[in-house]
């Protein structure tokens, strides 16, 4: 079942979830100037079977000021050099998220995508905390929260993690400290965004993993 | 909790032209596309068309174009729906739905009548 | 345009019971299916996406299946709250269509 509401804002931090769970939506979203095709499809889909999940749909978009014209999903070198995916982002592979049963990794990015990625999570779905760059945790439990549903309605748990103005940056569960990103993009301090940087992460897998976080807003 | 408040009933002579409007609240109103929706009795669920607010992009059932147009403004969160040269063929119930994840408002009632 | 057929207008069920409506798309749409349940007076409310996923709030008695052209709501354990009519749409490509509807009444 889909979650009704945004996981919970900290002020200055951003969330990820480092698999989606079947059913997640992605909503097809493109750039300033560019437009979802009229019958493209309107999100992605996480979905599958025990044994394997993946991506349904492709978004595709087109320029707006171009009629009947589609762009291919397949991203361009410059656009792959700014998203990074998790495939492209060191000699050693990550574990495949999708290795966790009925989970989906992070798709990968498709040409003239919009900024921010809109997910519709579903029940059971996890999000990690960290604060953004020149806030310090301050830990009081998990830095995590878990979309849940109670007596037919759905809401996400309240992360313990405060996040305090000290000139230094936090890690997700696991991180011994955060690498920089290769471009030194700034972290954004808009706390439903989580932006483009890298870092070692923990999954529920207790596997480490680098991956690259894509501007988010989830709604 | 998403949220889509339309306007009131309305009664109006044929030949004559109408505007819908639609109230987003509870989520991000740019950052979805919001569709329009005829229910007449008899006749099902017709689809007329939708907008995305962000970028005043348009998409239109080949049925209802000439017929309807859609607008948006963001500063309000407010979707319009304008309709022109009425005729008793318009008379039917209105609902503007936010297209996915979908959430539809309660529904404007449209009488043509002289 | 493509035309969703909800053969049948009505179905008539008991509380308890377990129902299936049908909905068959004139040409395949893979997985891009809803269904909605409206009640007399009322806007439709969305139960089912990408033809088996199911909306927050909606009880899991409600399952939805199917892909290509055919799809099947399904209503286990009917209660009277159930009785509505369903409607399937597409929404693989535009124009958006929807199924003519499924009035669902007690036997």
């Known amino acids: 079942e889909l979650c009704d509401d945004d996981p919970p804002e900290i002020p200055h931090a951003t969330f990820k979830a480092m698999a989606y769970k079947e059913g997640t939506m992605l909503n097809c979203e493109c750039k300033r100037g560019f437009r979802r095709i009229k019958s493209g499809s309107l999100y992605m889909l996480c979905t599958g079977n025990s044994s394997h999940s993946s991506w349904d749909n492709q978004c595709q978009c087109t320029s707006s000021a171009t009629r009947n014209t589609t762009k291919q999903v397949t991203p361009q070198p410059e656009e792959q050099k700014e998203r990074k995916t998790t495939e492209m982002q060191s000699p050693m592979q990550p574990v495949d998220q999708a290795s966790l049963p009925g989970h989906c990794r992070e798709p990968p990015p498709w040409e003239n995508e919009a900024t921010e990625r809109i997910y519709h999570f579903v029940v059971g779905q996890m999000v990690y905390y960290q604060c953004v760059q020149g806030y310090r945790a301050l830990h009081r439990g998990p830095a995590e929260s878990v979309c849940k549903m109670t007596h037919g309605k759905t809401r996400w748990t309240q992360p313990q993690l405060i996040c305090t103005g000290e000139m230094e940056t936090s890690q997700f569960p696991g991180e011994e400290k955060p690498q920089a990103s290769p471009e030194g993009r700034p972290e954004s301090e808009t706390s439903c965004l989580v932006t483009t940087t890298d870092f070692q992460i923990q999954t529920e897998m207790a596997a480490t993993m680098e991956t690259s976080i894509f501007t988010t807003e989830y709604q | 909790h998403v949220q889509l408040q339309q306007s009131g009933a309305e009664l109006v002579r044929p030949g004559t032209s109408v505007k819908i409007s639609c109230k987003a609240s509870?989520?991000?109103?740019?950052?979805?596309?919001l569709g329009w929706v005829k229910q007449r009795p008899g006749h099902g669920l017709e689809w007329i068309g939708d907008i995305y607010p962000g970028g005043g992009y348009t998409n239109y059932n080949e049925k209802f174009k000439g017929k309807a147009t859609l607008t948006a403004d963001t500063s309000s969160s407010t979707a319009y729906m304008q309709l022109s040269s009425l005729t008793s063929e318009d008379s039917a119930v209105y609902f503007c739905a936010r297209v996915t994840p979908a959430s539809w408002g309660q529904g404007t009632s449209l009488t043509v009548s002289s | 345009d493509i035309v969703m057929t909800q053969s049948q207008k009505f179905m008539s069920t008991s509380v308890g019971d377990r129902v299936s409506v049908t909905c068959k798309a004139s040409q395949n749409v893979g997985t891009n299916v809803a269904w909605y349940q409206q009640k007399p007076g009322q806007s439709p409310k969305a139960l089912i996406y990408s033809a088996s996923y199911r909306y927050s709030g909606v009880p899991d008695r409600f399952t939805g299946s199917g892909s290509g052209t055919d799809f099947t709501l399904t209503i286990s354990n009917v209660q009277s709250e159930d009785l509505a009519e369903y409607f399937c749409?597409?929404?693989?490509?535009?124009?958006?269509?929807f199924g003519g509807g499924t009035k669902l009444e007690m036997k």
């Open positions: 509870g989520y991000t109103f740019t950052n979805y596309w």
């Open positions: 749409q597409q929404y693989n490509s535009y124009p958006y269509t």
